[in-house]
């Protein structure tokens, strides 16, 4: 039961995380205009990975896509790449993990196959989460660097009468969404890897060994049956060990509505 719960929870957490990574990647608010210690402007600037937007006091919002590829900063390209890799890996991970779920039966899939698939999806989720966290962190670092550079520029080179206000950008909502989503995907991946350990069959081979005792004849036969001693009323063979790593939660049961995520 614990393995199914761990696997299911890992899947759900990863699903939420990947949805968050996709949302963060698509969001326009990766960086937002810093309003602190800034002259009160009637326009609010914010930027995403794919376009920059301006919201006027009038309510009119204008967004312009970054139509150039070569003209964009290398760091922005790197962040885009990390986020896309994270999404792709996460999506593949989700696909794999669906088939790996214990509550979903596909033909006569071996437990070892499910364990391998669970491990694969877990690793994919971990890498996906790390990609997202790395991408968001690179962007955040870029913002911090630019923020202090623009702050320095604000207080220098103002010898002339006319002042130009430097627009400074700070962390946008997408960064926090990305960090949380990346973390969730990572946690989900770790949970899948933990679940995999519980799913993996323990390869234990019990060879047939015949012991000839001087008094009573006690034979241990392969196939999981304990032979009776030949004495007394206990003449039925009782199945006490099956040789496989089958746990109690693997007992056949009809799937409930909670089994499907």
């Amino acid at each position: 039961m614990a393995v199914t719960a761990c696997q299911g929870l890992g899947f759900v957490v990863s699903l939420i995380g990947i949805a968050g990574i996709i949302a963060a990647t698509c969001m326009d608010q990766w960086s937002t205009q810093d309003l602190y210690n800034n002259p009160v402007t009637a326009v609010f600037n914010y930027q995403g990975l794919w376009r920059s937007c301006v919201r006027e006091s009038s309510g009119f919002t204008e967004c312009r896509g970054y139509f150039t590829l070569l003209g964009l900063p290398a760091m922005l390209q790197a962040v885009r790449a990390l986020m896309i890799v994270g999404i792709v890996l996460g999506a593949i991970g989700l696909l794999v993990s669906i088939f790996a779920l214990k509550c979903i039966r596909i033909g006569s899939m071996e437990d070892s196959a499910k364990a391998n698939m669970t491990l694969t999806s877990g690793i994919m989720f971990i890498v996906s989460g790390l990609c997202a966290i790395a991408g968001v962190s690179v962007f955040a670092n870029m913002l911090v660097t630019n923020f202090w550079m623009s702050t320095a520029n604000m207080y220098t080179g103002m010898g002339g009468m006319v002042q130009t206000v430097q627009t400074r950008y700070t962390f946008g909502a997408a960064l926090f969404v990305g960090w949380v989503a990346g973390g969730l995907t990572l946690i989900g991946g770790v949970m899948m890897c933990i679940a995999c350990r519980g799913l993996a069959p323990e390869e234990t081979n019990y060879k047939a060994v015949s012991y000839h005792a001087s008094g009573h004849s006690v034979a241990y036969k392969p196939g999981g049956f304990k032979a009776s001693t030949g004495f007394g009323s206990n003449t039925k063979n009782k199945k006490i060990y099956d040789g496989g790593a089958r746990t109690e939660d693997e007992v056949q049961s009809y799937p409930s509505k909670h089994d499907y995520v």
């Epitope: 009160v40 920059s52 006027e56 009038s58 309510g59 312009r64 002042q163 206000v165």
Partner: antibody, heavy 118, light 113 residues
């Protein structure tokens, strides 16, 4: 078409209060902020501030903080300018105007003349 | 507050003539986010409310004759009337729409001979 109709001229004594209305039609009232502009006789235009008709939040120019209050009533599609404790220098024509592209004042009311005389 | 300086204060021209008036702001009105200048031009005829002519420094409001043209960027802006008509007799105001408060210029009074 968009129209802003302001209340009629007002004759007030110093120290009194005046409330000017600006009724909007031809658009969704809460979609555009309402600005107020003062024009003293023979003088230029002076931006007083604006009210976000969706949130009710107001922004005032420094010269118009204190005695001046903007308000709006969505159901009546009307914005209001209230001036308390009227002074002689408040004698002017007051215009309401909606915010448009580029934060411009796109549509204007006909103006309300407020006369302050003892 | 942003100071908007308009010059000249008065302009007397003949019908059909080209006229240019200027507006200078104490700070740049260019927004780096969309590369637009938040400067607006209005026309106020005697006894009437102002009328929007140009926003974003150079975008003509619908219904405004194409003889009116706005130009400039940053701190220096110009309104040009390519061929003045008798009905253009008015005061022209520029306005900063980037920083609060939205200050107006003192106006340029255009008289047609």
């Amino acid at each position: 078409q968009i129209q802003l109709v302001q209340s009629g001229p007002e004759l007030k004594k110093p120290g009194e209060t005046v409330k000017i209305s600006c009724k909007a039609s031809g658009y969704t009232f809460t979609n555009y902020g309402m600005n107020w502009v003062k024009q003293a006789p023979g003088k230029g235009l002076k931006w007083m501030g604006w009210i976000n008709t969706y949130t009710g939040e107001s922004t005032y120019a420094d010269d118009f903080k204190g005695r001046f209050a903007f308000s709006s009533e969505t159901s009546a599609r009307t914005a209001y300018l209230q001036i308390n404790n009227l002074k002689n220098e408040d004698m002017a024509t007051y215009f309401c105007a909606t915010l448009g592209y580029g934060n411009s004042l796109a549509y204007w009311g006909q103006g309300t003349l407020v006369t302050v005389s003892s | 507050d942003i100071v908007m300086t308009q010059y000249p204060s008065f302009l007397t021209v003949t019908t059909g003539e080209k006229v240019t008036m200027s507006c200078k702001s104490s700070q740049s009105l260019l927004n780096s986010g969309n590369q637009r200048n938040y400067l607006t031009w209005y026309q106020q005829k005697p006894g009437q409310p102002p009328k929007l002519l140009i926003y974003w420094a150079s975008t003509r409001e619908s219904g405004v004759p194409d003889r009116f043209a706005g130009s400039g960027s940053g701190t220096d802006f110009t309104l040009t009337i390519s061929s003045v008509q008798a009905e253009d007799l008015a005061i022209y105001y520029c306005q900063n729409n980037y920083f609060y408060p939205f200050t107006f210029g003192s106006g340029t009074k255009l008289e047609v001979k």
